[in-house]
């Protein structure tokens, strides 16, 4: 009961998470105009990753899209990168574990393919929310860079009483809904892993029988080597577990982590 | 037709007070920033007060700050503003507008004359 | 608070001739977002209330004849009537819209020589 509501729990949180994270990505106010230095501007100045867009004080919004691809700085196409893989990682994460869930029943499913999807959408919403915590700390970090550099020339004098005041950007709202969407999805993977290892069927606890052979006296436990070999007596062709562990064959099916690099 | 109509100038004494009133009609007032804008007799244009479509910004020219109130009521689709310590100064014809691109005020109404004299 | 400065105060232009009007801002009117200038021009006849001419600094209201042409960027700003006709008399005034207060300059008066 507890696997079914961690594993149900893990997979709402991550839908949020996963749902931030694509309201984010297509929020348009990741950095925001700083009025620090002019609190009653006329106009507002907001950008997002895909356009940047004007408010103006009569209540007219003009935004324009960046039409360009060459033309925009590495570090906006990285992060663009990271929330889009983030958003695929965690729509295909989504999906799997649909199909994971205990509370949901798909033909003779066993409980240990449940328990291998279980763990492969945990590590896919891991890594979603690692992505949209990296880009949203990438955009961040960009901002701070820039709004330190534009404090530092803040006023282009232009001869005599002129100035020009250079706009500064801070902190927008996406950026926020980023990192807590992130953050959910990747406490959602988390409990989905955990979820994962309940799933999995109990060990069945033979007793240790001792087999007398010609000329040895060797004691074996059917199936005790199974987790480290891939040998062992298995006549009823169950899967056999020793304290957690699993086959080889098992452990290859799942994605390890340099799978998503 | 985008139509502003100002009432409520008219004498009032120094220290007086007085509201104005601007009625729209042809938009929907809620969605638009508007303004106050005041021209003494042979004068030049002053900028009075401004509120934003939601009521969530307003400013006030220095030279009004404190005595003046601007105010909406939406779904009367009316805009005022409310005039405490009249001075011999504020005498001037009072016109609202409504900006739209480029914050320029596209629509003005015709305008409501105050006198302030003793 | 920003102060708009309109050359000359008055103009006396020949009907069919150019008429130039001047308007200097004490801070730059550019806006980095969209790269617009915000900076207006209203026509006001006696007896009524402004006219928008020109707003985006050089963007001509709708209705407005194409002889109003706006230009210029960041401080400095022109208003042009490439061909004065006579309905074209009248006081002409720019306006800061980029940061409150909404400034206007003094306002320039055009008549015909």
């Known amino acids: 009961m507890a696997v079914t509501a961690c594993q149900g729990l893990g997979f709402v949180v991550s839908l949020i998470g996963i749902a931030g994270i694509i309201a984010a990505t297509c929020m348009d106010q990741w950095s925001t105009q700083d009025l620090y230095n002019n609190p009653v501007t006329a106009v507002f100045n907001y950008q997002g990753l895909w356009r940047s867009c004007v408010r103006e004080s009569s209540g007219f919004t003009e935004c324009r899209g960046y039409f360009t691809l060459l033309g925009l700085p590495a570090m906006l196409q990285a992060v663009r990168a990271l929330m889009i893989v983030g958003i695929v990682l965690g729509a295909i994460g989504l999906l799997v574990s649909i199909f994971a869930l205990k509370c949901i029943r798909i033909g003779s499913m066993e409980d240990s393919a449940k328990a291998n999807m279980t763990l492969t959408s945990g590590i896919m919403f891991i890594v979603s929310g690692l992505c949209a915590i990296a880009g949203v700390s990438v955009f961040a970090n960009m901002l701070v860079t820039n709004f330190w550099m534009s404090t530092a020339n803040m006023y282009t004098g232009m001869g005599g009483m002129v100035q020009t005041v250079q706009t500064r950007y801070t902190f927008g709202a996406a950026l926020f809904v980023g990192w807590v969407a992130g953050g959910l999805t990747l406490i959602g993977g988390v409990m989905m892993c955990i979820a994962c290892r309940g799933l999995a069927p109990e060990e069945t606890n033979y007793k240790a029988v001792s087999y007398h052979a010609s000329g040895h006296s060797v004691a074996y436990k059917p199936g005790g080597f199974k987790a480290s070999t891939g040998f062992g007596s298995n006549t009823k062709n169950k899967k056999i577990y020793d304290g957690g562990a699993r086959t080889e064959d098992e452990v290859q099916s799942y994605p390890s982590k340099h799978d998503y690099v | 037709e985008v139509q502003l109509v100002e009432s409520g100038g008219g004498l009032v004494q120094p220290g007086g007070s007085l509201r104005l009133s601007c009625a729209a009609s042809?938009?929907?007032?809620?969605?638009?920033?508007m303004h106050w804008v005041r021209q003494a007799p042979g004068k030049g244009l002053e900028w009075v007060s401004y509120?934003?479509?939601?009521?969530?910004?307003?400013y006030y020219a220095d030279s009004v700050k404190g005595r003046f109130t601007i105010s909406r009521d939406n779904p009367k689709n009316s805009l005022y503003l409310q005039m405490n310590s009249l001075r011999a100064e504020d005498t001037a014809v009072y016109y609202c507008?409504?900006?739209?691109?480029?914050?320029?005020?596209?629509?003005w109404g015709q305008g409501t004359l105050v006198t302030v004299s003793s | 608070d920003i102060v708009m400065t309109q050359s000359p105060d008055s103009l006396a232009v020949s009907l069919g001739e150019r008429a130039t009007i001047n308007c200097k801002s004490s801070?730059?009117?550019?806006?980095?977002?969209?790269?617009?200038?915000?900076l207006t021009w209203y026509q006001q006849k006696p007896g009524q209330p402004p006219k928008l001419l020109i707003y985006?600094?050089?963007t001509r209201e709708s209705g407005v004849p194409d002889r109003f042409s706006g230009s210029g960027s960041g401080t400095d700003f022109t208003l042009t009537i490439s061909s004065l006709q006579a309905e074209d008399v009248a006081v002409y005034y720019c306006?800061?819209?980029?940061?409150?207060?909404?400034?206007f300059g003094q306002g320039t008066k055009l008549e015909i020589k």
């Open positions: 507008a409504r900006a739209y691109y480029g914050n320029g005020f596209s629509f």
């Open positions: 042809g938009f929907t007032l809620n969605n638009f920033g």
């Open positions: 509120i934003s479509s939601g009521s969530g910004t307003i």
């Open positions: 801070q730059s009117l550019l806006n980095s977002g969209n790269q617009k200038n915000y």
């Open positions: 985006w600094a050089s």
């Open positions: 306006q800061n819209v980029y940061s409150y207060p909404l400034t």
